[in-house]
């Protein structure tokens, strides 16, 4: 797929790794919350 224009911003390059890590952390937390919710249900 075509890269979005924002990928040309230097910031995108310098923060790519940390933003990916933050997103993965967010997803993991979301999955954990979902699991807890399922347990309650």
């Amino acid at each position: 797929s075509e890269e979005p224009p924002i990928s040309l911003d230097l910031t995108f390059h310098l923060l790519r790794e940390v933003l990916e890590m933050a997103r993965a952390e967010q997803l993991a937390q979301q999955a954990h919350s979902n699991r807890k919710l399922m347990e309650i249900i």
Epitope: P5, D9, L10, R23
Partner: antibody, heavy 118, light 112 residues
Framework: QVQLVQSGAEVKKPGASVKVSCKAS????????MKWVRQAPGQRLEWMGV????????FYNQKFKGRVTITRDTSASTAYMELSSLRSEDTAVYYC???????????WGQGTLVTVSS | DVVMTQSPLSLPVTLGQPASISCRSG???????????LEWYQQRPGQSPRLLIY???NRFSGVPDRFSGSGSGTDFTLKISRVEAEDLGVYYC?????????FGGGTKVEIK
């Protein structure tokens, strides 16, 4: 031309919160990250955080994590920075800034003075 | 955090004469991609900062050629070949190679 126009000066009491806005024009708002930097009297410039207006990803300087919230409204081409639990040391000029493909802070807002005083 | 140390704190200059500002980083600011994200900013009294130099030695668009940047690793310099009245203000170095991004403490260029 690229323009970043910030909201006006604010005076706040310790413990309160402040929300500063930054309206972008002259370019496609979602094509560039927006950063926030502050300058307290007699202190060096401090980078506070950054938002990807396209996807909403945010990354904060650990120093401010928990107290600062950066958001955006793409329909209004505006970024916001909210700082909570204000103390006197937060008295500063707050800037929004945008980079390019070559540099991190190529264009700056005019700055917003936030004064925290009881 | 990478500490950026500038010297001198204050630089009295004579208009038309050269000026030089030093910036040292507490550790190497060569990024893992082999680039050095060292930038210089000028802040005139009462104004917002303005980008002068990016990646150590590249002038940003509209910046006069009397400004030049050099250095590598941990040691960087901003030179003004002939200081003009409009150059008076505070100059900051900045590193974007390591998070958190950090600025130097500033050097005030003033009339002697």
């Amino acid at each position: 031309q690229v323009q970043l126009v910030q909201s006006g000066a604010e005076v706040k009491k310790p413990g309160a919160s402040v929300k500063v806005s930054c309206k972008a024009s002259g370019y496609t708002f979602t094509d560039y990250f927006m950063k926030w930097v502050r300058q307290a009297p007699g202190q060096r410039l401090e980078w506070m955080g950054v938002i990807n207006p396209n996807q909403g990803d945010i990354f904060y300087n650990q120093k401010f994590k928990g107290r600062v919230t950066i958001t955006r409204d793409t329909s209004a081409s505006t970024a916001y920075m909210e700082l909570s639990s204000l103390r006197s040391e937060d008295t500063a000029v707050y800037y929004c800034a945008r980079g390019t493909d070559r540099a991190l802070f190529a264009y700056w807002g005019q700055g917003t003075l936030v004064t925290v005083s009881s | 955090d990478v500490v950026m140390t500038q010297s001198p704190l204050s630089l009295p200059v004579t208009l038309g004469q050269p000026a030089s500002i030093s910036c040292r980083s507490g550790q190497s600011i060569v990024h893992s991609d082999a680039n050095t994200y060292l930038e210089w900013y000028q802040q005139r009294p009462g104004q917002s900062p303005r980008l002068l130099i990016y990646k150590v030695s590249n002038r940003f668009s509209g910046v006069p050629d009397r400004f030049s940047g050099s250095g590598s690793g941990t040691d960087f310099t901003l030179k003004i070949s002939r200081v003009e009245a409009e150059d008076l203000g505070v100059y900051y170095c900045f590193q974007g190679s390591h998070i958190p991004w950090t600025f130097g403490g500033g050097t005030k260029v003033e009339i002697k």
